[in-house]
C-alpha cells in the first residue's frame, strides 16, 4: 500500500481467483484513543472499533472511503483504491490502446517546435467518475523540472455504438533550450482513477522525436500566363522555432484530383514556393517536416486548384 | 557565445554541402545498423545516449544562433578555446565566435573519426562479419574536415591488445551512430544558419 495523495491510498493486488489479497492497517488521524468506530462509504454498519482497523483487501467491495467516527463526529477519512496486477502485468482498463505508433500506446505526445512545450493526449470510453493527474520530468534518476497543467476533456467522438473521450494535457519543460541536443528523455506519468480503480500510464520520449510542425501558413496560388501551371507559395507556421535558417523545414507539395484514385503529383522542396500543374478539380496541398531530423509531417494546408 | 549575423560568405557553401552529405550518410548507416543488428538493442529507446564529445567540445553553445543567446537555458558556463583558422571562414572579418564554432565542429568530427576507425578495425575481426562501417560515411567525415581545414594534432588511433567483445562493440556502434546523427543534425543546422547569415 502507498499514499497517492493526502488520505488516498493505493492497494496493489495480485488479481486472480481466490487470491489472498492484502492485509491493510488503517489508522485514525486523531489524538483520541477510545470510543472510535469505523464505517465504509455511506453504510452505517460498524466494521470495527479502536484507533486502527485491520482489513483484508481482496476485491473492489473492500475498497472505498473508510471513515473513523467518535460520538457521531467524523474524525478522518482514508480512501482505498485498488491497482490490479494480472499475470504480473498492471491493468490498463481505463485507457484505450491507440496502437500508434505501436501496440500498447496509451499516451501520445506531440510538440509543435523545440521550445520544450508539448501536448499529450489519451482516449477512454469512460464518461463519469474519472480523474487524471499528470506529472513529468526530464530524466528519471536526477529529474529536471517539467510543469504540466490539468488534464482536460478535449474531444468527444462516436465510434460505432461507443462514445470515445479524448483528454489532453499541456506541459512545458522549465528550462529548455531549443538548440540543445537531448540525451535524457522526457518522462510523462499519468495517474488515472475510475471509481475505485487506480492505474498508471507512462511515456518516455525525446522532444525531437515527437515534433510535428503546424501546417504551412498563407498558402497562395499565382497562375502562370497561358499555362495551367501555378506558382504555389507559403510561409513557415508561426509556431515553428526560430531562427528559421537554423530550424529549417522541408516541404511536400501535392496536387490531388477529386477522386482518391487519381494519380497524385508530389514535389519535395526546401524553398517556400514551387511550380506545379493544376489538374481539373484538383487541390494543392503543402505540408512541412523538420529538414534535418525526420519526425512527423505536419497536417496538410490546402487550396483549390483554380 | 553565439554566431553573429555575418556578411554572406561564399566559403560557407562547400561546408553546407558537405554537412548535408554527412547527415545523409550517418542516417543511412544508422538505418543499416538497426536493420542488420535487429536482435541487438539498437533503437533510440533501447540504447544509452552517450556523447563522446561531452566536456571536450561545446558545439551547441559555441554555435548558438544569435537569436537564442537571449535564452538563458541555452547559455552554458563552459569555456573552451579553439584554434581560429579555417577555409570555411573565407573572410578575415569572420568573428572569433564563428571560428570557435567551426573549430568545435572540426574537433567533434576528429573524435568521431577516431572512434569509428577503431571500431571498424574491431568489426573487421568479427568472424560473423555482420556489419562494417560504411566507407562513404568515413569519406564524408574526411571531406567535411578538409573543408573546415583546421590545423590540429592528429589523434592516434586507439589500439587494443585484448580480444574484442563483438557484442559490446556492436552495441557501442549503435550508441555512437545515434549520438553522431544528433550531432550531424546540429552541424547541418549551424551550416544552414551561417549560409543564410
Amino acid at each position: 500500500i502507498w499514499e497517492l495523495k493526502k488520505d488516498v491510498y493505493v492497494v496493489e493486488l495480485d488479481w486472480y481467483p481466490d487470491a489472498p489479497g492484502e492485509m491493510v492497517v488503517l489508522t485514525c488521524d486523531t489524538p483520541e484513543e477510545d470510543g472510535i468506530t469505523w464505517t465504509l462509504d455511506q453504510s452505517s454498519e460498524v466494521l470495527g472499533s479502536g484507533k486502527t482497523l485491520t482489513i483484508q483487501v481482496k476485491e473492489f467491495g473492500d475498497a472505498g472511503q473508510y471513515t473513523c467516527h467518535k460520538g457521531g463526529e467524523v474524525l478522518s477519512h482514508s480512501l482505498l483504491l485498488l491497482h490490479k496486477k494480472e499475470d504480473g502485468i498492471w491493468s490498463t482498463d481505463i485507457l484505450k490502446d491507440q496502437k500508434e505508433p505501436k501496440n500498447k500506446t496509451f499516451l501520445r505526445c506531440e510538440a509543435k517546435n523545440y521550445s520544450g512545450r508539448f501536448t499529450c493526449w489519451w482516449l477512454t470510453t469512460i464518461s463519469t467518475d474519472l480523474t487524471f493527474s499528470v506529472k513529468s520530468s526530464r530524466g528519471s534518476s536526477d529529474p529536471q523540472g517539467v510543469t504540466c497543467g490539468a488534464a482536460t476533456l478535449s474531444a468527444e467522438r462516436v465510434r460505432g455504438d461507443n462514445k470515445e473521450y479524448e483528454y489532453s494535457v499541456e506541459c512545458q519543460e522549465d528550462s529548455a533550450c531549443p538548440a540543445a541536443e537531448e540525451s535524457l528523455p522526457i518522462e510523462v506519468m499519468v495517474d488515472a482513477v475510475h471509481k475505485l480503480k487506480y492505474e498508471n500510464y507512462t511515456s518516455s520520449f525525446f522532444i525531437r522525436d515527437i515534433i510535428k510542425p503546424d501546417p504551412p501558413k498563407n498558402l497562395q496560388l499565382k497562375p502562370l500566363k497561358n499555362s495551367r501551371q501555378v506558382e504555389v507559395s507559403w510561409e513557415y507556421p508561426d509556431t515553428w522555432s526560430t531562427p528559421h535558417s537554423y530550424f529549417s523545414l522541408t516541404f511536400c507539395v501535392q496536387v490531388q484530383g477529386k477522386s482518391k484514385r487519381e494519380k497524385k503529383d508530389r514535389v519535395f522542396t526546401d524553398k517556400t514556393s514551387a511550380t506545379v500543374i493544376c489538374r481539373k478539380n484538383a487541390s494543392i496541398s503543402v505540408r512541412a517536416q523538420d529538414r534535418y531530423y525526420s519526425s512527423s509531417w505536419s497536417e496538410w494546408a490546402s487550396v483549390p486548384c483554380s | 557565445r553565439n554566431l553573429p549575423v555575418a556578411t554572406p560568405d561564399p566559403g560557407m557553401f562547400p561546408c553546407l554541402h558537405h554537412s548535408q552529405n554527412l547527415l545523409r550518410a550517418v542516417s543511412n548507416m544508422l538505418q543499416k545498423a538497426r536493420q542488420t543488428l535487429e536482435f541487438y538493442p539498437c533503437t533510440s529507446e533501447e540504447i544509452d545516449h552517450e556523447d563522446i564529445t561531452k566536456d571536450k567540445t561545446s558545439t551547441v553553445e559555441a554555435c548558438l544562433p544569435l537569436e537564442l543567446t537571449k535564452n538563458e537555458s541555452c547559455l552554458n558556463s563552459r569555456e573552451t578555446s579553439f584554434i581560429t583558422n579555417g577555409s570555411c571562414l573565407a573572410s578575415r572579418k569572420t568573428s572569433f565566435m564563428m571560428a570557435l564554432c567551426l573549430s568545435s565542429i572540426y574537433e567533434d568530427l576528429k573524435m568521431y573519426q577516431v572512434e569509428f576507425k577503431t571500431m571498424n578495425a574491431k568489426l573487421l575481426m568479427d568472424p560473423k562479419r555482420q556489419i562494417f562501417l560504411d566507407q562513404n560515411m568515413l569519406a564524408v567525415i574526411d571531406e567535411l574536415m578538409q573543408a573546415l581545414n583546421f590545423n590540429s594534432e592528429t589523434v592516434p588511433q586507439k589500439s587494443s591488445l585484448e580480444e574484442p567483445d563483438f557484442y559490446k562493440t556492436k552495441i557501442k556502434l549503435c550508441i555512437l551512430l545515434h549520438a553522431f546523427r544528433i550531432r550531424a543534425v546540429t552541424i547541418d543546422r549551424v551550416m544552414s544558419y551561417l549560409n543564410a547569415s
Partner: antibody, heavy 119, light 110 residues
C-alpha cells in the same frame, strides 16, 4: 509552332488506319493534343485527346473505336475498324495552354487530312 | 454534353451586330471552360475566344464573348465582310469525356 496531319487515304470498311500528327516548335511533354474530325458539310466533332503526361480521354461515342498514342514528336490516331460514317477530314489541334486541361481551348490547328471509307 | 447553338444560319449586314448563343446541357468546368472558333471553307478552325470571354491574340476587338455556367454568347459588333464563316463553341467539363463542340452557326454577311 506547327502541326501537320498525314496518313489520310481511301480505305475499305474494316481496314485499320493510323493517322499521324507531326509537331514542331514545341514539346509534347508539356502540351495536350486533340483529334477533331469534320464530315463533309457537317460540324466539328471532338474525338479525343492525349495529355502532356500521356493520359488519354475519348468522347463517349469514340471509346473503343479510336486509340490515341504519342512519341516525342508525333501523335497517332488509330481507327480500329473504319466504317463509311468515319469519312471526314481529321484535324489535330494543340491545347492552347501549357499543361492544358482536356477541353481547354485548341490552338494551333493542323490543316487536316482527308479519310474516305468506301467499298 | 450537348452544346446547342442558335440561330443557324444568321444573316448580318456590314457594320451591324451579330449575337450567337451557345447553350450547354450541363455546367462547363469552373463555369468558364468554353471557347469559340471561326472556320472558313477549306481551312482549319481558328481560336477567337477562350475561358468564355478572353480574346485570343491577334483577334479583332469587335469579337467578344460572355456568359457563365450553361449559357454563353459570342457577339460580333461592326460586322465586316471577312466575318462570313461558321462559328463553333467548344465546352470542357468535369468529366473529360463530355468535351464537345456545338453544332455550328453559319454567319452570312449581306
Amino acid at each position: 509552332q506547327s502541326l501537320e496531319e498525314s496518313g489520310g487515304r481511301l480505305v475499305t470498311p474494316g481496314t485499320p488506319l493510323t493517322l499521324t500528327c507531326t509537331v514542331s516548335g514545341f514539346s509534347l511533354s508539356t502540351y495536350t493534343m486533340n483529334w477533331v474530325r469534320q464530315s463533309p458539310g457537317k460540324g466539328l466533332e471532338w474525338i479525343g485527346a492525349i495529355s502532356y503526361d500521356g493520359g488519354t480521354a475519348y468522347a463517349n461515342w469514340a471509346k473503343g473505336r479510336f486509340t490515341i498514342s504519342k512519341t516525342s514528336t508525333t501523335v497517332d490516331l488509330q481507327i480500329a475498324s473504319p466504317t463509311t460514317e468515319d469519312t471526314a477530314t481529321y484535324f489535330c489541334a494543340r491545347g492552347f495552354y501549357v499543361y492544358a486541361y482536356i477541353g481547354d481551348a485548341f490552338d494551333p490547328w493542323g490543316p487536316g487530312t482527308l479519310v474516305t471509307v468506301s467499298s | 454534353a450537348v452544346l446547342t447553338q442558335t440561330p443557324s444560319p444568321v444573316s448580318a449586314t456590314v457594320g451591324g451586330t451579330v449575337t450567337i448563343k451557345c447553350q450547354s446541357s450541363q455546367t462547363v468546368y469552373k463555369n468558364n471552360l468554353l471557347s469559340w472558333y471561326q472556320q472558313k471553307p477549306g481551312q482549319p478552325p481558328k481560336l477567337l475566344i477562350y475561358l468564355a470571354s478572353t480574346l485570343a491574340s491577334g483577334v479583332p476587338s469587335r469579337f467578344s464573348g460572355s456568359g457563365s455556367g450553361t449559357q454563353f454568347t459570342l457577339t460580333i459588333s461592326g460586322v465586316q465582310c471577312d466575318d462570313a464563316a461558321t462559328y463553333y463553341c467548344l465546352g470542357g467539363y468535369d468529366d473529360d469525356a463530355d468535351t464537345a463542340f456545338g453544332g455550328g452557326t453559319e454567319v452570312v454577311v449581306v
